[in-house]
């Protein structure tokens, strides 16, 4: 939802968290603001306190329940409002009718581990976190490997077009330190975006055997 120079963007992690960012040019930093969530067909509502993340933007997380509980479904619509205190009153600054499963951003993959490493290849696995069972296998992943002397931005993206929670990295250099990251995205949702990148996993390929061609 955008009002002039105001922007209010929220994502659902598919289970029990809605994360919101509100930005407004010229807003006072010390103003007390909240996000209110009112589902259209549930008995609960939820509020979180917006905290500054930059000069003109605030963020907060609506915690709807325990991390793995399915608090919203595919047919829920949640009215989200930004409310700011003006003296003794609250003023509505932004509003949107939020369809959770059209605005998904999953949690970053976790539990990255090296399954097997050789001189030229490395097999890595991971797990998805707090992802709804609704998706079945309809998820995709992007992965990238940081090579020595390069930046993450330079790393080519590898795409896995199915729910595959492992990858075999090939054509690596022996006895070399690498880092690896992965992120996940459901196919569902018009405004769905990639999860954050996972924490990097550092690994080292095995040295080449002495006296052998590599």
């Amino acid at each position: 939802a955008v009002n002039g120079t105001s922007r209010f963007t929220c994502f659902y992690n598919s289970r029990a968290n809605i994360s919101c960012v509100w930005s407004q040019d010229g807003a006072l930093q010390d103003t007390s603001c909240q996000v209110h969530a009112w589902p259209d067909r549930r008995r609960w509502n939820q509020t979180c306190e917006l905290l500054p993340v930059s000069q003109a933007s605030w963020a907060c997380n609506l915690i709807l329940g325990t991390p793995d509980s399915q608090k919203l479904t595919a047919v829920d619509i949640v009215t989200l409002r930004v409310m700011c205190r003006e003296g003794v009153r609250w003023r509505m600054m932004a509003i949107q009718d939020f369809k959770p499963f059209e605005n998904l951003r999953l949690m970053a993959p976790i539990s990255l581990q090296v399954v097997h490493v050789e001189t030229h290849r490395c097999n890595i696995s991971w797990k998805i976190s707090q992802a709804s069972h609704y998706f079945e296998r309809h998820l995709e992943f992007e992965a990238r490997t940081l090579s020595p002397g390069h930046t993450w931005e330079e790393a080519p993206l590898m795409t896995l077009k199915q729910k595959q929670e492992w990858i075999c990295l090939e054509t690596l250099t022996p006895d070399t330190q690498y880092e690896f990251q992965v992120r996940v995205k459901p196919l569902q949702g018009e405004f769905t975006t990639w999860s954050p990148w996972s924490q990097p996993l550092a690994f080292r390929t095995k040295p080449a055997a002495l006296g052998k061609d590599t």
Epitope: T73, V75, Y134
Partner: antibody
Framework: EVQLVQSGAEVKKPGATVKISCKVS????????IHWVQQAPGKGLEWMGW????????EYAPGFQDRVTITADTSTDTAYMELSSLRSEDTAVYYC??????????WGQGTTVTVSS | EIVMTQSPATLSVSPGERATLSCRAS??????LHWYQQKPGQAPRLLII???QSISGIPARFSGSRSGTEFTLTISSLQSEDFAVYYC?????????FGQGTKLEIK
């Protein structure tokens, strides 16, 4: 192999209730959604509703919500659809299916229900 | 309730030729459109999800596309086993609704 096996054909009188079963195998029933779809001769395919087995939550289409009840028995990996106050236009093939909320990945073989006096 | 309109109701095509089936939504549904195939006496089978994503195990000759509220299922080179009824289904607004179907028959 994913399988959904439905109970056999039924003949019912108007006003009666029918209960169809859907026994599943080849996947984790507790982490699934089981849907029911009606295919009546003149009306095409109509989504009746679903049950989220894990949460125990149901969602019914407005056209059926007054008369349909969907349940699940996790001890037998079986879902049920009960349709009450039957009328002649409920004569149809009823399918159970597994999928996320948005589309149906695997289907049962269908159960024919005939409503006739 | 969103109304899904499929056209034509019946399509006659020769084996080996291309078939193009259309599905139009009565309002904007983003890419929340899925295609099924149903043969006589059988349950429907899922072919394409989200307008254009093929389901694993479905032959590559089946493809989907979207232009606004109009969706197209294309079968590039018809095989004998492709003659069936095809349904589209929206999942944008509950209740999800199906089109009335297009019967693809041998010319």
């Amino acid at each position: 192999e994913v399988q959904l096996v439905q109970s056999g054909a039924e003949v019912k009188k108007p006003g009666a209730t029918v209960k169809i079963s859907c026994k599943v195998s080849g996947f984790n029933f507790k982490e699934s959604l089981i849907h029911w779809v009606q295919q009546a001769p003149g009306k095409g395919l109509e989504w009746m509703g679903w049950i989220d087995v894990e949460a125990g939550e149901t969602e019914y289409a407005p056209g059926f919500q007054d008369r349909v009840t969907i349940t699940a028995d996790t001890s037998t990996d079986t879902a049920y659809m009960e349709l009450s106050s039957l009328r002649s236009e409920d004569t149809a093939v009823y399918y159970c299916a597994r999928g996320g909320p948005w589309f149906l990945s695997y289907w049962g073989q269908g159960t024919t229900v005939t409503v006739s006096s | 309730e969103i109304v899904m309109t499929q056209s034509p109701a019946t399509l006659s095509v020769s084996p080996g030729e291309r078939a193009t089936l259309s599905c139009r939504a009565s309002q904007i549904i983003s890419n929340n459109l899925h295609w099924y195939q149903q043969k006589p006496g059988q349950a429907p089978r899922l072919l394409i999800i989200y307008g254009l994503q093929s389901i694993s195990g479905i032959p590559a000759r089946f493809s989907g596309s979207r232009s606004g509220t109009e969706f197209t299922l294309t079968i590039s080179s018809l095989q004998s086993e492709d003659f069936a009824v095809y349904y589209c289904q929206q999942s944008n607004n509950w209740p999800w609704t199906f089109g009335q179907g297009t019967k693809l028959e041998i010319k």
